[in-house]
C-alpha cells in the first residue's frame, strides 16, 4: 500500500502536487509499512479495542487563515477516556481518586510503555531496531527522552505527508509559500505503540485556509458605550479603532504597514502607520467604515522578462530587482544579466487586507458628575446607618437607570451594588439616595445608563460618626 491509499480520499491533481511542495514533507506515493502500521477502515470492529477503557479523541486545530508565505501551525491534542492521563514518563495512567464506569482501578497503568520498551528493546545499545521506524521505514529521531514519546502522528495534505513522534500533544508548522490559495484539507492519523508494532487510535481532519489577503480584524472601543459588540456607538465621543492583523507566525514583523481609513461620514481618507486611530462622529445615523491595510511582505520574485533584443548594449550588473508590487507589471529590464538572481535575494510584494463594518451612531449619556453630597438628617436620635443624597448631573441623552457600587476606600472590595430605574427630566438633574452602614471612608462608583450608554463617575466619601454632640458633616 502507498500512503495515499491509507491516508485519505483527497487526491490532488498532478499540477497541485507539483506546485505545492512542502519543505520537509514526502510524497504520498511512498510505500506504507502495513505490517508495523495496520490500516483499518472506518467502521472496522477493531477500532473498538484500539484503546483500553474507551476511544481516544484527537482534536486538530490550526492558526488558519495564513497569509501565503507565512507559516501555519497545526496542533493535535489527544483526549483520553475519563480518568486517564499521560504521566511524566509518557505512560498512560489512571488519575487518582477518579471513578469511571469500571470504578477505581487497582492497576495504576493503562499503558506502561516504559516496561514494554525495557522488555522489547534488547538491541545492541544503539537504541535502533527494525520497529522503531515510521510507516515509510525512516527511523525515529533520537531526541533526548524519545523513548517517552509513544504516539506516531502522520499528517497528510496536498499529496504529501509528514511523520512525527510525540506525546499526547504535538505541533507541526508548515510554510505556505508554495501552497495554492484557498481552503485545503489536513488529515492526521495517530498510532500508539503496541509491543513491536503500532495500533491506530484516532483519525481527524480539519480545513485550513491560505490567502493572499492580510487577515484583518478591528476592535472598536468607546467610553460610555454599553455594548461594544453591537456596532452601535455614541455621538460626540471618540471611538478607538484598533487593527489586529492575524499573523501568528510574525511573517509581517519587519513590514511597513499602512492603514487607510474611510469613516463614511464625509471626513475624507485618513492614512496612518499606527494600528490604532480615534474618530468622533458628530451626527446620528448609519455609516460605512472601510479600512485597507497595505504591507510590503516577502513574496515571489517576478518572472524574468522576455529575452533582450541583441542590438542593445549591456547595462551594468548594479541594477537588481528588490521590490515588486502585485498590482504593477514586472520591470521592463532587457538585460539577461540584470535578472539573474543573486542567491537568497528577497523580493517583496504588496499584500492588502480589507475590513468593512456598518456602524450606527446614536445619542448617549456623554458625561456624569456628582455636584453635591448631603447627609440626610434622620428623625431618630441614634440611627444605625447614614443616608447620603448625591446630586448628579449628566450630559447627553436621558438616563433610565442609576447604579451605585459602594466599596472600600481603595475601590477594590465591593460592599454593595444597587441599581434602580430613575426618572430624570430633560435638564438631567437627579438626586440619588443611598444608605451607608456605619462611619468611615467609602468609594462610590455611580453609573447612569440608558439603552446604549453607561457613564461612570467615582468619588470618595467620608461618613462621620453619629455622635449626637458632633455636627453632621460631609467630607469628600
Amino acid at each position: 500500500k502507498r500512503f495515499h491509499d491509507v491516508l485519505g480520499n483527497e487526491r490532488p491533481s498532478a499540477y497541485m502536487r507539483e506546485h505545492n511542495q512542502l519543505n520537509g514533507w514526502s510524497s504520498d506515493e511512498n510505500d506504507w509499512n502495513e505490517k508495523l502500521y495496520p490500516v483499518w477502515k472506518r467502521g472496522d470492529m477493531r477500532w473498538k479495542n484500539s484503546w483500553k477503557g474507551g476511544r481516544v479523541q484527537a482534536v486538530l486545530t490550526s492558526d488558519s487563515p495564513a497569509l501565503v508565505g507565512s507559516n501555519i501551525t497545526f496542533a493535535v491534542n489527544l483526549i483520553f477516556p475519563r480518568c486517564q492521563k499521560e504521566d511524566a514518563n509518557g505512560n498512560i495512567v489512571y488519575e487518582k481518586n477518579c471513578r469511571n464506569e469500571a470504578g477505581l482501578s487497582a492497576d495504576p497503568y493503562v499503558y506502561n510503555w516504559t516496561a514494554w520498551s525495557e522488555d522489547s528493546d534488547g538491541e545492541n545499545g544503539t537504541g535502533q531496531s527494525h520497529h522503531n521506524v515510521f510507516p515509510d521505514g525512516k527511523p525515529f529521531p533520537h531526541h533526548p527522552g524519545w523513548r517517552r514519546w509513544n504516539f506516531i502522528y502522520v499528517f497528510h495534505t496536498l499529496g504529501q505527508y509528514f511523520q512525527k513522534l510525540g506525546r499526547c500533544s504535538v505541533r507541526v508548522s508548515v510554510n505556505t509559500a508554495n501552497v495554492t490559495l484557498g481552503p485545503q484539507l489536513m488529515e492526521v492519523t495517530v498510532y500508539r505503540r503496541h509491543g513491536r508494532a503500532y495500533v491506530p487510535i484516532a483519525q481527524v481532519k480539519d480545513v485550513y485556509v491560505v490567502t493572499d489577503q492580510i487577515p484583518v480584524f478591528v476592535t472598536m472601543f468607546q467610553k460610555n458605550d454599553r455594548n461594544s459588540s453591537d456596532e452601535t456607538f455614541l455621538k460626540d465621543l471618540p471611538i478607538m479603532f484598533d487593527v489586529l492583523i492575524h499573523d501568528p507566525s510574525h511573517f509581517l514583523n519587519y513590514s511597513t504597514i499602512n492603514y487607510k481609513w474611510s469613516f463614511g461620514d464625509n471626513t475624507g481618507l485618513f492614512v496612518s502607520t499606527n494600528h490604532t486611530v480615534n474618530h468622533t462622529y458628530v451626527l446620528n445615523g448609519t455609516f460605512s467604515l472601510n479600512l485597507t491595510v497595505k504591507a510590503a511582505a516577502p513574496g515571489p520574485c517576478p518572472p524574468p522578462p522576455p529575452p533582450p533584443r541583441p542590438s542593445k548594449p549591456t547595462p551594468s550588473l548594479a541594477t537588481t530587482l528588490k521590490s515588486y508590487d502585485s498590482n504593477t507589471p514586472g520591470p521592463a529590464g532587457d538585460n539577461p544579466l540584470e535578472l539573474s538572481r543573486i542567491p537568497d535575494e528577497n523580493c517583496q510584494i504588496n499584500r492588502y487586507g480589507h475590513f468593512q463594518a456598518t456602524i450606527t451612531i446614536v445619542e448617549g449619556i456623554l458625561e456624569v458628575n456628582i455636584i453635591q453630597m448631603t447627609d440626610v438628617l434622620m428623625p431618630v436620635p441614634w440611627p444605625e446607618s447614614s443616608l447620603i443624597d448625591f446630586v448628579v448631573t449628566c450630559q447627553g441623552s436621558i438616563p433610565t437607570e442609576v447604579c451605585t457600587i459602594i466599596s472600600d476606600p481603595t475601590c477594590e472590595i465591593t460592599q454593595n451594588t444597587v441599581c434602580s430605574p430613575v426618572d430624570v427630566d430633560e435638564m438631567c438633574l437627579l438626586t440619588v439616595r443611598r444608605t451607608f452602614n456605619g462611619s468611615g471612608t467609602y468609594c462610590v462608583n455611580l453609573t447612569l445608563g440608558d439603552d446604549t450608554s453607561l457613564a461612570l463617575t467615582s468619588t470618595l466619601i467620608s461618613v462621620p460618626d453619629r455622635d449626637p454632640a458632633s455636627p453632621l458633616r460631609m467630607a469628600n
Partner: antibody
Framework: EVQLLESGGGLVQPGGSLRLSCAAS????????MSWVRQAPGKGLEWVSS????????YYADSVKGRFTISRDNSKNTLYLQMNSLRAEDTAVYYC?????????WGQGTLVTVSS | QSVLTQPPSASGTPGQRVTISCSGS????????VSWYQQLPGTAPKLLIY???QRPSGVPDRFSGSKSGTSASLAISGLRSEDEADYYC???????????FGGGTKLTVL
Amino acid sequence: EVQLLESGGGLVQPGGSLRLSCAASGFTFAARPMSWVRQAPGKGLEWVSSISHSGGSKYYADSVKGRFTISRDNSKNTLYLQMNSLRAEDTAVYYCARKWSTFDYWGQGTLVTVSS
Amino acid sequence: QSVLTQPPSASGTPGQRVTISCSGSSSNIGNNYVSWYQQLPGTAPKLLIYADSQRPSGVPDRFSGSKSGTSASLAISGLRSEDEADYYCGAWDSSLNAYVFGGGTKLTVL
C-alpha cells in the same frame, strides 16, 4: 394638565388575549418612562410592568413574565400592554401610570375580567 | 404576601395625628426612595409622598414622610374625615428588579 386614559379592558376567557392602551396627554410622553399597575377586586396594588422613555428598557413582575408585553408608540403618545395566556388571577383593574421609580400620575383604570 | 409590610388598618379621631409604618429591606427601602399613595374609595391611587419625604404640589403639609434604615413612615396630622382611604407605600427593589408595594393600610377616621 396631565391625563392618562386607559382602554381595551373587558371580559375574556382563560388562555385568551387582550391588548390594553393608554393615551397620554399634557406632558412630553417621549421623555418619560411609563408603567402599568393593577388591583384585583378588594385587594392591594400590584406593579405589573414598566418601560423606559425610548422603549429600550423593560421590566416585568414575575407573575406576568413571558405572558405580558409592554410597548409604546411615542409618535402616538400611547402606551400598550399586550396580555396573552390570561388566567383568572389576572382579573383586576389595570392602571396606567407615569414614570417608574414613583408613579406621579395615574389613569382611572380599565377592568379586565378573566372568566369562563 | 407583600414585600413591604404595612399594618392592615389604622384609625384616629379628627384632629389627631396618626402614623402608618412600612417595613422593608436594604434592597428596597434601604437604598431606594419610598413613595406613599392614597386611594380614596372607588378612585384611582394618587401620589402623596415621593423621594421619602417630598410632597407633590397640591398635597397638604399635614402629610409628611420619613425614612430610617429599612423602614419608612407616613404621618398625617390634623386628621380629617376626607383622609379616610387606603394608603400604600412603594419602592423599587434592586434585588427583584421590580417595583414593590406594601399590602396597604385602611385608615378609618372615627
